[in-house]
Structure formats: C-alpha cells, structure tokens
Interface confidence: low
C-alpha cells in the first residue's frame, strides 16, 4: 500500500495522526468495526496532550475510545501497553460494576462527560473517535 | 529500580495453609496489577493469579481456583496470596511479577507440600 | 484456554550464531507476546513485550516478530552469557499461559 501522508477529507489532523469524530452513537463493537473499515482504530490515548485534544473535540459527551477488557486484561486496539501507558480514570474507575441489570460487567472505556474515563456495558449506543497514523502504509480494503 | 521480594514460602502438609508475601518498591505500586507464577522443580512456568491496581479485578488459574485467594494493601506496597487446602502438586517455586506483560520479577519463594 | 508451544524444546549452536525460537499460539493473540530469558539462580528478566517491543536495557541483539498465531525470538549473535532458557507467555487473555520452554546451550 501507499504511505498516507495527509488526512482523509472531514478528519482532523494532530501531531501527525488524523481523527474523525462521530456525530451518532454505536455500541462499542460496531464503533470498532466502523473505524477498522476505515482503516483506522478506535482512539488510542498515549499522553495527557492527546487526552486534552481530544477532550476538546468532544465536549462534554459519553465518547468510546480503542480500550476494552473483553478478555480479562486491560487492551488497547491497537496493542500500546496498558500498564505502564497514560491514564486518566475517574475516581475508583474502573469497577466493572454488575449492578446495572444488563447482564455481565463493564468491559469497554470512554470519555465520561469531564474527560475522565469510565468503563461501561460495551452495548450503549455512544459517541466515537476513531484515530489513523499519517506515514503508516495505507493496506487496501479486503475485498468481500 | 523497580524491586520485588517474596517471602512466606517453607514446607506445610497436604490440606494446610500458607500465606505468600510480595514486597514492592521503585514503583507507584497501586498503578499496577500485579501477577503470581510458579514453577514447580525442573518443570515450565504456570500463571497462578492477577490482581488490578485497585483489587477490583481478580483472576485466578483453574488449578487453584477456590483454594488460593489474590490480595493487595497499597497503603503497605505489598501482595499477598493466601493458600488454602495445599497439595503435593502446588509444590513450586512462587513468583511475584508486575503487569499482564510479566515486565519485572521477584527471586522466588519455596513452597513445598509434603507429608 | 490459549495453548503454547515452542520449538525446538532445545537447542546447541556456537558462539556468534544467529539463534531463532519459534512460538505459537493455539489462537489468534494479535501482539499480546512476551518473552523471557531464565537462568539459574536469577529473577526470570523480560526481554519482549508486545511480540516485538524492547524491554528497556536489553541488548539490541535480542528482536522479536510474528502477529496473530506465529511469533519469533533472535538472537543476532549468540554469546556465552545467552546461555539461559527462554519462553514466550501470551497475556491476551485469561488464564495467561506460557510456552514450554526452549533450553539454549552450547556446542
């Protein structure tokens, strides 16, 4: 594939990696599968300046970002190290709380409505940004 | 420099107790799970158990599900595993390491269950 | 659960040699790979994370590669100190498993 070396049209370019922001709202799995079509991740957030850019474009609206437990550990999408990466959990966050009646805990994370993260029921319809690296070679569509 | 110690290791009968420690230090311990692995004598490593930083998460190997419970005191840098009802097959060197990834280990205690 | 295997189980080369351990996972793991060097009498040392990342005062001489189910450990030049047995650990999910072992000595 060739290298991108600008961002797509609508996607909003920062220290050398675009954004797209949704104006919709999906559950957790389907907004990974919408930013993987576009050859993007869910967001992947490495520093307290990634987190205030974000958080800028957002405002203050239940967002998912590219981090999940589904199989036990704490993962980003795109394979950053959790443990030893930045974070910027909410208070006792997270819980994997039980107590919301849908069945299992809390397995997905997002942007709560001060920026801080929170892990939720990966199935609510929320917002989502979907990140992509300028230089990394393009690979084109699978074909289906 | 990130330093992990164990102690608690020594020899107990089958079905009796012990209680491992980990002391940690160079590092903001409740920012990190924290991990249990053994190695029985002359034989692989073995995953025993994980814990979140906040002791909201456990995990623990089908082996010693039951019998061992994973806990943390933030306050005093250290992890602990208390072990229940022991077998000759628990019988291994135990290791404490830092984060999913395995990044840093400790020496190793001996816990051998004998008879 | 999420089986390991390495190959070979162990090996003999000479100093300066090009040494490659093979691990795979039962499943598709995506990068969630370590590898660790065991010597007797020593705390086991992280040497990989993330099937391809340098742990921080490794030498460059160790590289790791493979995605997915297929992954490998190099040493571009083996020396007398690299005597040691190395595993792969998946930390995809729970339970976290390891491979068996590969035992690296000398000629």
């Known amino acids: 594939g060739s290298e991108r070396t600008c961002c797509p049209v609508n996607w909003v370019e920062h220290e050398r990696s675009c954004y797209w922001f949704s104006r919709s709202g999906k559950a957790w799995a389907d907004a990974d599968n919408y930013c993987r079509l576009e050859d993007a991740h869910l967001v992947v957030v490495t520093s307290w300046e990634e987190q205030k850019f974000v958080q800028h474009h957002i405002g203050p609206v239940n967002t998912w970002m590219g981090l999940h437990d589904q199989n036990g550990p704490w993962k980003w999408v795109d394979g950053t190290d959790y443990e030893t990466g930045f974070k910027n959990w909410r208070p006792e966050q997270p819980d994997d709380w039980y107590g919301h009646g849908l069945g299992g805990g809390e397995d997905c994370a997002h942007f709560t409505d001060d920026g801080r993260w929170n892990d939720d029921v990966c199935q609510r319809p929320y917002r989502w940004v979907c990140e992509t690296e300028l230089d990394k070679a393009s690979q084109e569509p699978p074909l289906l | 420099e990130v330093q992990l110690v164990e102690s608690g290791g020594g020899l107990v009968k089958p079905g009796g107790s012990l209680r491992l420690s980990c002391a940690a230090s160079?590092?903001?311990?409740?920012?990190?799970?924290m991990n249990w692995v053994r190695q029985a004598p002359g034989k692989g490593l073995e995953w025993v158990s994980s814990?979140?930083?906040?002791?909201?998460?456990?995990y623990y190997a089908d082996s010693v599900k039951g019998r061992f419970t994973i806990s943390r005191d933030n306050a005093k840098n250290s992890l602990y595993l208390q072990m229940n009802s022991l077998r000759a097959e628990d019988t291994a060197v135990y290791y404490c390491?830092?984060?999913?990834?395995?990044?840093?280990w400790g020496q190793g205690t001996l816990v051998t269950v004998s008879s | 659960d999420i089986q390991m295997t390495q190959s070979p189980s162990s090996l003999s080369a000479s100093v300066g040699d090009r040494v490659t351990i093979i691990c795979r996972a039962s499943?598709?793991?995506?990068?969630?790979l370590a590898w660790f060097q065991e010597k007797p009498g020593k705390a086991h040392k992280s040497l990989i994370y993330?099937?391809?990342s340098l742990r921080s005062g490794v030498p460059s001489k160790f590289s790791g590669s493979g995605s997915g189910t297929d992954f490998n450990l190099t040493i571009s030049s083996l020396q007398p100190e690299d005597l040691a047995t190395y595993y792969c650990?998946?930390?995809?999910?729970?339970?976290?498993?390891f491979g068996p072992g590969t035992k690296v000595d000398f000629k």
């Open positions: 390491a830092r984060v999913a990834a395995l990044d840093s």
């Open positions: 160079g590092f903001t311990f409740s920012s990190y799970s």
């Open positions: 814990i979140s930083g906040s002791s909201s998460y456990t």
């Open positions: 499943q598709d793991i995506s990068n969630y």
């Open positions: 993330g099937a391809s």
């Open positions: 650990q998946q930390y995809h999910s729970y339970p976290f498993t």
